[in-house]
Interface confidence: medium
């Protein structure tokens, strides 16, 4: 599973992220969620096969033909800045659900450049598909400096 480690958008814009997966995950459910703790995720959005799923301002759609699923976050706000996760292939770990394949994305949101005028057509940031190893440093140090290492992380679902 591959994707960008960081994404950035402006308030009011839409942002799309493309998560690429291997052929063997073609029929598996695809997930997007906001990471609370290393093993804990909230605001989970799931899609099956090529169906589109929507929750609030988040839409997730699988494209099995080109082995990607796309997550679109609409009308970004400053409070959307957080750590998120793309994931596939749910298995049972130690009595709780967890993802076999996953990667984390640090989403930053900046104020819009022209807060006075009402926004026109929403801008969509380019879909980024930076190739990352499933294991290995995904984010590096956070600006707050609290994270010594930050690996692509598994999690447990509620």
């Amino acid at each position: 599973l591959h994707g960008p480690s960081t994404m950035s958008g402006s308030v009011g814009e839409s942002l799309s992220v493309s998560c690429r997966y291997e052929e063997k995950f073609k029929t598996k459910d695809k997930y997007w969620c906001r990471v609370s703790l290393k093993i804990l995720c909230k605001d989970i959005v799931k899609t099956s096969s090529s169906e589109e799923a929507r929750s609030g301002r988040v839409t997730i759609r699988d494209h099995p033909d080109n082995l990607t699923f796309t997550v679109t976050y609409e009308s970004l706000t400053l409070e959307d800045a957080d750590t998120y996760m793309c994931a596939v292939d749910i298995s049972l770990f130690d009595g709780s659900l967890g993802f076999d394949k996953y990667f984390k994305i640090e989403l930053s949101v900046v104020p819009s450049e022209d807060p006075v005028s009402s926004p026109g057509p929403t801008l969509e940031t380019p879909v980024v598909s930076t190739s990352l190893p499933t294991k290995g440093p995904a984010l590096g140090s956070n600006t707050e400096g609290h994270r010594e290492h930050d690996y692509s992380q598994g999690l447990r679902l509620p």
């Epitope: 906001r34 290393k38 804990l40 750590t83 130690d94 709780s96 967890g98 994270r147 598994g154 679902l157």
Partner: antibody
């Protein structure tokens, strides 16, 4: 049954390094999803989270104390460790280790540490 | 980084209902899970509510958790308050892998 037991020096002097050990049973830090954290509580005051370490050796620290904290683990002996350098009287507290889970945290009984000259 | 604010103390009567609040300073209270811990004098904290509103086995159903988005707060409600409920209550949430604790409420 999950059990966590903290141990430490009891008392130490300012500027020394505090070394704490959490010995646990009922889970393994080599298992996917497992972690151990440290929290402290000065007498009569609130809880302050210090650090977490996870099965894959990922480490998280309280940013206000990060330059003084080192968390580590010994998976084979079911132990986690926390070192706090250059201690001061403000570090006097009960120190807890805890196992984070998706159903809240399991806490040890805590160990009292006094920093006094 | 946000702060969780709790009232220092709350007094109530035996058998009544009490609500303890935990207000998030910035960002949405619903963005990250909230846990509630009870701590009796001289004891270690125990989980009363996890993931906003879920109760661990063994915790009486008098205890419930909820999210109040209008006040950007988490709430711990205790119905039919008993003498053994007198304790300190701490809320806790998460921020990018870190724990954030509220200052605690002493329930008298």
């Amino acid at each position: 049954e999950v059990k966590l037991v903290e141990s430490g020096p009891g008392i130490l002097q300012p500027s020394q390094t505090l070394s704490l050990t959490c010995t646990f049973s009922g889970f393994s830090l080599s298992t996917y999803g497992m972690g151990v954290g440290w929290i402290r509580q000065p007498s009569g005051k609130g809880l302050e989270w210090l650090a977490n370490i996870w099965w894959d050796d990922d480490k998280y620290y309280n940013p206000s104390l990060k330059n003084r904290l080192t968390i580590s683990k010994d998976t084979s002996n079911n132990q986690a460790f926390l070192k706090i350098t250059n201690v001061d009287t403000a570090d006097t507290a009960t120190y807890y280790c805890a196992r984070p889970t998706t159903e809240g945290d399991y806490w040890g009984q805590g160990v009292m540490v006094t920093v006094s000259s | 980084q946000f702060v969780l604010t709790q009232p220092n103390s709350v007094s109530t009567n035996l058998g009544s209902t009490v609500k303890l609040s935990c207000k998030r300073s910035t960002g949405n209270i619903g963005s990250n899970y909230v846990n509630w811990y009870q701590q009796h004098e001289g004891r270690s904290p125990t989980t009363m509510i996890y993931r906003d509103d879920k109760r661990p086995d063994g915790v009486p159903d008098r205890f419930s958790g909820s999210i109040d988005r209008s006040s950007n707060s988490a709430l711990l409600t205790i119905n039919n308050v008993q003498t053994e409920d007198e304790a300190d209550y701490f809320c806790q949430s998460y921020s990018s892998g870190m724990y954030i604790f509220g200052g605690g409420t002493k329930l008298n």
